[in-house]
């Protein structure tokens, strides 16, 4: 044959034309639309690496390949049928025409067709191999996917169970928090109840404390009375002992009478060589009864017996007659020595009275009376003063002539009112008079316009309450 030409017709079928002498044979073959062309860059039987395809893509591609396989199979069957039909037709024609020399051509054509069929079969085999390869690969991918899916499912299940656990834990904690809140509310309520109970208790305790304070005051008074009784007893005992020793010494002259050293006031203490400020034990005149007093051994030559001191408001000076009689407070701080002792002492010899004052602005002043004494209790410890000098006013802030002593329970003033009640504290009130060093103690910045405070009128006026006061006595001949 001269040539073999392959071309495409208008409807897209492949035409195989064979020219042999004067005869021309045309074979129309059906085209495999979904097959790759031989020029396609695809290597047959090559094992491809796994591409990271999505599961859905893999399934789609598998379906496409299955379709191609099916189409190929159908095409092969059609081709076989077609060849058989054509061979039959050719053989009939050859037989009819009885052209012997065409047999070789037909055989050649048949051979060519067979070759083509073989080629197509080979190609199909390649395609099959490719499909199998792809299928295997896809199966592997699917397996991997399923494994991955299983793994993910397991993870999801694990996470779900973990979430459930956490939710359980959370709900447990929420319950616990709610329980705690309830508990907290209950606790708060109980605390509030406790607080209320405590407040009630505190107020009860306060009233108890007040009662106890009253009892203490009573006890102090009783104690003072007992002390006095004890001193009296001691005195009696001493007298008896003296009497006994006297009678004994009359019998036995070798027994010597023991001499006791006692001080009537701080001047005597000073003269005995004790020149240091402090608390000393003094003895009542003509008695063994003792009392503790603070001695100022420095101011103005020393020897001063402190009979009153105010300095910080630590001691309540709104006291009873008995308390002012025997004394109260602390000799090293705020105190009242006692009217009875001062009365007895100042009636033994002539004493001077010095009153030292301090205001809240750092100023100091004093009033000195050259003669001072107190009457007996029968005359209400009336004060007697003469000869005023000093810097705390030219006029005496203790009314002249002297007044009786008054306390909250011993009203001896010249007012229709009760001065001790109105101005507080025990003092030699007139009606009520220009002074009261035993008044209410007012702290700084609260000490003005206070008319029931620590007053020394002719130095600071009625409404000024002083910071500190000291009343001291010393024999005039010291």
């Amino acid at each position: 044959y001269n040539n073999f030409r392959k071309s495409m017709d208008s409807i897209g079928k492949k035409q195989y034309q064979v020219q042999h002498g004067s005869c021309s044979y045309t074979f129309l073959l059906p085209e495999m639309d979904n097959c790759r062309s031989s020029s396609s860059p695809y290597v047959s039987n090559a094992v491809q690496r796994d591409a990271p395809l999505e599961y859905d893509d893999s399934v789609q591609r598998l379906q496409v390949l299955e379709n191609i396989m099916e189409n190929n199979t159908q095409w092969l069957m059609k081709l076989e049928n077609y060849i058989q039909d054509n061979m039959k037709k050719e053989m009939v024609e050859i037989q009819q025409n009885a052209v012997q020399n065409q047999t070789a051509v037909m055989i050649e054509i048949g051979t060519n067709l067979l070759n083509q069929t073989a080629e197509q079969t080979r190609k199909l085999t390649d395609v099959e191999a490719q499909v199998l390869n792809q299928t295997t690969r896809l199966e592997l991918q699917l397996l991997e996917h399923s494994l991955s899916t299983n793994k993910l499912e397991k993870q999801i299940l694990d996470q779900t169970s973990e979430i459930n656990k956490l939710q359980d834990k959370n709900s447990f904690l929420e319950k616990k928090v709610l329980a705690m809140e309830d508990k907290h509310i209950i606790q708060l309520q109980s605390i509030k109840e406790e607080k209320d109970q405590l407040q009630v208790l505190v107020s009860k305790q306060n009233s108890i404390i007040e009662e106890l304070e009253k009892k203490i005051v009573t006890a102090t008074v009783n104690n003072s009375v007992l002390q006095k009784q004890q001193h009296d007893l001691m005195e009696t005992v001493n007298n008896l002992l003296t009497m006994m020793s006297t009678s004994n010494s009359a019998k036995d002259p070798t027994v010597a009478k023991e001499e006791q050293i006692s001080f009537r006031d701080c001047a005597e203490v000073f003269k005995s060589g004790h020149t240091t400020n402090g608390i000393y034990t003094l003895t009542f005149p003509n008695s063994t009864e003792e009392i503790k007093a603070y001695c100022d051994m420095e101011a103005g030559g020393g020897g001063w017996t402190i009979i009153q001191r105010r300095e910080d408001g630590s001691v309540d000076f709104q006291r009873t007659w008995k308390e002012y009689k025997v004394g109260f407070g602390n000799p090293s701080g705020e105190y009242w020595l006692g009217n009875e002792f001062v009365s007895q002492l100042t009636n033994q010899q002539r004493y001077v009275l010095k009153i030292h004052l301090k205001d809240w602005e750092g100023n100091e002043a004093y009033s000195l009376y050259e003669h001072f004494y107190l009457s007996s209790e029968e005359l209400n410890y009336r004060i007697h003063l003469k000869g005023l000098t000093g810097t705390a006013g030219k006029i005496s802030s203790i009314s002249q002539p002297g007044n009786d002593f008054s306390t909250k329970d011993g009203d001896n003033d010249k007012c229709i009112c009760k001065c001790s009640q109105m101005l507080t504290g025990g003092w030699w009130f007139d009606a009520c008079g220009p002074s009261n060093l035993n008044g209410m103690y007012y702290p700084q910045r609260q000490n003005t316009n206070k008319f029931n405070g620590i007053k020394w009128y002719y130095w600071k006026g009625s409404g000024y309450s002083l910071k500190a006061t000291t009343m001291m006595i010393r024999p005039a001949d010291f």
Partner: antibody, heavy 122, light 106 residues
Framework: AVQLVASGGGLVQPGGSLRLSCAAS????????IHWVRQATGKGLEWVSA???????YYPGSVKGRFTISRENAKNSLYLQMNSLRAGDTAVYYC????????????????WGQGTLVTVSS | IVLTQSPGTLSLSPGERATLSCRAS???????LAWYQQKPGQAPRLLIY???SRATGIPDRFSGSGSGTDFTLTISRLEPEDFAVYYC????????FGQGTKVEIK
């Protein structure tokens, strides 16, 4: 007997001045705090000022800076100098003695004068 | 401290008991509370001081009581001369009066 007699009241224009006096007798004037108390017609009592025996003075905020209280112990006399008078100062003014001596503002008033009328009007 | 008196007016007949109230805005010491009587055209007159002590020359039908914030003036049997205006006063380092209670004949 203790006696207090107030005088010096009268009609005065707003912004004007007036001086009231109070004569005391029957007690030791130099020992007592003396007060001025006023009463507007049909109204209650209002404390106006006080003076101590040695001249220490006390005022409420309503009159501070406008009124001045003073005394002459030798004459047993008390005074109230009223300046910058207002219509609200119209009242009967009483002088009164404190119940206690040297009491300042811690005493009620045991003796009162009969009062003197002050009218502030234009 | 503000003192509030009640009632504003008390209408009673002679021989009846009169009870006048004085209330302080905060607790005060009874030592520093007084009562006065004032008749028309006259100066006030001290009746009670220290909440319960009668002033010189005051009849015993007048009595005072109370503590803290509540104080009372009692006239046990009203006499014709008792019909007047009554004031309470606080005098603890300051001077304050109540607005008054008028006791009138019924």
């Amino acid at each position: 007997a203790v006696q207090l007699v107030a005088s010096g009241g009268g009609l005065v224009q707003p912004g004007g001045s007036l001086r009231l006096s109070c004569a005391a007798s029957g007690f030791t004037f130099s020992s007592y705090d003396i007060h001025w108390v006023r009463q507007a017609t049909g109204k209650g009592l209002e404390w106006v000022s006080a003076i101590g025996p040695a001249g220490d003075t006390y005022y409420p905020g309503s009159v501070k800076g406008r009124f001045t209280i003073s005394r002459e112990n030798a004459k047993n006399s008390l005074y109230l100098q009223m300046n910058s008078l207002r219509a609200g100062d119209t009242a009967v003014y009483y002088c009164a003695r404190g119940l206690i001596t040297f009491g300042g503002l811690i005493a009620p008033f045991d003796y009162w004068g009969q009062g003197t009328l002050v009218t502030v009007s234009s | 401290i503000v003192l509030t008196q009640s009632p504003g007016t008390l209408s009673l007949s002679p021989g009846e008991r009169a009870t006048l109230s004085c209330r302080a805005s905060q607790s005060v010491s009874s030592t520093y509370l007084a009562w006065y009587q004032q008749k028309p055209g006259q100066a006030p007159r001290l009746l009670i001081y220290g909440a319960s002590s009668r002033a010189t020359g005051i009849p015993d039908r007048f009595s005072g009581s109370g503590s803290g914030t509540d104080f009372t003036l009692t006239i046990s049997r009203l006499e014709p001369e008792d019909f007047a205006v009554y004031y309470c006063q606080h005098y603890d380092n300051s001077q304050t009066f109540g607005q008054g209670t008028k006791v009138e004949i019924k």
